[in-house]
């Protein structure tokens, strides 16, 4: 009878053990072990047992011990089971980020691993257990589908394998994978709504102002503001899911013409982007042209009106004939004309409003002077002693110089307050002298006596 | 469709004068800034002068400043380039580009026209 | 300075996908636009603004950019997409309206 010990082992891969094979017999004519194993006969005294060390054990294997004895031939076999654990564990690699609301697939690899009925495969969120079965397959895979939430943002998902050979007098081989964080994110399915103008004047500054609401996390989110293909550096502020991006923009003479505004918000691996068109224009005043912004009186003024070449023009109220960006009108100039304001209104229709500009110039038209009847009357009879104020008006552009004298020395003080006396009595010669010429015109002053009863 | 189609090319000694012309169509001539941009035998592109849409501004690049002319007439949907005092290195193919905007990238090429300066 | 940088040169195996890279100044305060010329042929716009493509242009084109650097990728080159690649954009200095780089030659094996 044979007989072997130990008859059952557990061992680590690669690992050896000493096995004993022994037979009833004193003297067996033959013992021994049939193994492919590396093995080594230590000696001892006796015939009837012998041990071996069989090494490097990668696999279960099962030695048979042998024995031929006068009665007969018999075996006996020990079992070897090899334990190690899994070569490889990990998640199956998923984008880091994941919106919320969408079933999130996790599956986990398990490479190797013995003996598997011992193997358990445990997905976690961080301690939490998601789902553990036993390895099958090789590799093992398992698999779970999570709904993602928004308070899974920043949790760690994780694969473990569990080696249970505490049953076997061992303990309980953990083996974990590599940590996946999930990073939920809410990008609502609305487009950032972005304000600015829809008009801007070449040499001026716009505001714009790109905001979305029901955003998680807020503070993660990319605004990419944009006016052509200028990048705008906004200020953002952050309320608890909004954002509100804020830039300035000023253009120049090189964006005139149609740019696209675009608001571009990245979260995860998604992004919402708002187009706008924004039109910059050019659109200096009108101009004014006199043909002399002064000329004397009876002159022909031709005023002429020009404007950007789309525009409308009315000049003093009057549009262009044809309508366009050109008008004129002729005038003899005449001293109603002196002061006389030319306005041009220029409009300019850009993506579909109305800009208006206006220029004004003033007309100085040089005549006179003028003395007449109305502003300095020939004819003034005045009380002795009573307080007059002499009035005599020249007329004129420029003003006339006036100087009214009797007998070529006296003068009559216009303007000023006097006490009439027989010597103001008279005919004074009133002369009023400009750059455009003179004119004379008498004057008398009559004094009247007082009456005594 | 939009097509921009160069003319006015050909042969000239150095110091004389040419003069290109861009014909447009399919697309809002006025409305659009329009650029010469010019490439010489085996070489890379290199942007020339620009113009706004109305015609109230024009750019030049400094190699060609005070010797060419960009206008442009809106009534007839043409661009022009006139070419002065020209240059061996300005022997080039010469493509008229269009943009939304002056400063804008190039939305519609012509095919181009060849100028050769040369004795 | 006012000057795009651009390798002369690069290939790309047929289906493969190959970057072309574009450096400047002008990068920092504007996007590039990329025109592919092929042989005997007017440039054509392939990408403009942060990453958009004009209708026509397959969706294989896409543009990025970084700092400044503005770069072109070609996912799954054809045999068609075998020509000079130009970035090009806004001066910043000044000197210019736009500026173009030196452009890239792709070979496509």
């Known amino acids: 009878q044979t007989s072997v010990s130990p008859s059952k082992v557990i061992l680590p891969r690669g690992g050896s053990v000493l096995v004993t094979c022994s037979t009833s017999c004193d003297q067996p004519k033959l013992l021994g072990i049939e193994t492919p194993l590396p093995k080594k006969e230590l000696l001892l005294p006796g015939n009837n047992r012998k041990v071996y060390e069989l090494s490097n054990v990668q696999e279960d294997s099962q030695p048979m011990c042998y024995s031929n004895c006068p009665d007969g031939q018999s075996t006996a076999k020990t079992f070897l089971t090899v334990y190690w654990t899994p070569e490889r564990v990990e998640l199956a690699p998923l984008p880091s980020w994941q919106p919320v609301g969408k079933n999130l697939t996790l599956r986990c690899q398990v490479e190797g691993g013995a003996p598997r009925a011992n193997l358990t495969v445990v997905l976690l969120r961080g301690e939490k257990e998601l789902k553990r079965e036993p390895a099958v397959g090789e590799p093992a895979e398992v698999t779970t589908t999570v709904l993602v939430r928004r308070d899974h943002h920043g949790a760690n998902f994780s694969c473990r394998t569990e080696l249970d050979l505490r049953p076997q007098g061992l303990e309980l081989f953990e083996n974990t994978s590599a940590p996946y964080q999930l990073q939920t994110f809410v990008l609502p399915a609305t487009p950032p709504q972005l304000v600015s103008p829809r008009v801007l004047e070449v040499d001026t500054q716009g505001t714009v102002v790109c905001s979305l609401d029901g955003l998680f996390p807020v503070s993660e989110a990319q605004v990419h503001l944009a006016l052509g293909d200028q990048r705008l550096n906004p200020t953002v502020t952050y309320g608890n899911d909004s954002f509100s991006a804020k830039a300035s923009v000023s253009v120049t003479a090189e964006d005139e013409g149609t740019q696209r505004l675009t608001c571009a918000v990245i979260l995860g691996n998604q992004s919402q982007e708002t187009l706008q068109t924004v039109t910059i224009y050019s659109f200096p005043a009108p101009n004014v042209i006199l043909t002399k912004p002064e000329v004397s009186e009876g002159t022909e003024v031709t005023v002429k009106c020009e404007a950007h070449p789309r525009a409308k023009v009315t000049l003093n109220g009057v549009p262009a004939q044809p309508l366009g960006p050109r008008a004129q009108l002729l005038l003899k100039a005449t001293p109603e004309d002196n002061g006389r304001s030319f306005s041009c209104s220029a409009t300019l229709e850009v993506a579909g409003q109305l800009i208006h500009k206006n220029q004004t110039r003033e007309l100085r038209v040089l005549y006179g002077p003028r003395l007449d009847e109305r502003d300095c009357p020939g004819n003034w009879t005045w009380p002795e002693n009573s307080q007059q104020t002499p009035m005599c008006q020249a007329w004129g552009n420029p003003l006339p110089e006036l100087k009214c004298l009797k007998d070529g020395t006296f003068p009559l003080p216009i303007g000023e307050s006097v006490t009439v006396t027989r010597d103001l009595e008279g005919t004074y010669l009133c002369r009023a002298r400009s750059t455009q010429g003179e004119v004379t015109r008498k004057v008398t002053v009559n004094v009247l006596s007082p009456r005594y009863e | 469709q939009v097509q921009l189609v160069e003319s006015g090319g050909g042969l000239v000694q150095p110091g004389g004068s040419l003069r290109l012309s861009c014909a447009a169509s399919g697309f809002t001539f006025s409305s659009y800034a329009m650029s010469w941009v010019r490439q010489a035998p085996g070489k890379g592109l290199e942007w020339v002068s620009a113009?706004?849409?109305?015609?109230?501004?024009?750019y030049y690049a400094d190699s060609v400043k005070g010797r060419f002319t960009i206008s442009r007439d809106n009534s007839k949907n043409t661009l022009y380039l006139q070419m002065s005092s020209l240059r061996a290195e300005d022997t080039a193919f010469y493509y008229c580009a269009n943009s939304a905007y002056t400063g804008g990238w190039y939305d519609y090429w012509g095919h181009g026209t060849l100028v050769t300066v040369s004795s | 300075s006012s000057e795009l940088t651009q390798d002369p040169a690069v290939s790309v195996a047929l289906g493969q996908t190959v970057k072309i890279t574009c450096q400047g100044d002008?990068?920092?305060?504007?996007?590039a636009s990329w025109y592919q010329q092929r042989p005997g042929q007017a440039p054509v716009l392939v990408i403009y603004?942060?990453?958009s493509r004009p209708s026509g242009i397959p969706d294989r084109f896409s543009g990025s950019s970084s700092g400044n650097t503005a770069s072109l990728t070609i996912t799954g080159a054809q045999a068609e997409d075998e020509a000079d690649y130009y970035c090009n954009s806004r001066d910043s200095s000044g000197n210019h309206l736009r500026v173009f780089g030196g452009g890239t030659k792709v070979t496509v094996l």
């Open positions: 113009i706004s849409g109305s015609g109230g501004s024009t």
């Open positions: 002008s990068l920092r305060t504007y996007y």
């Open positions: 603004g942060e990453n």
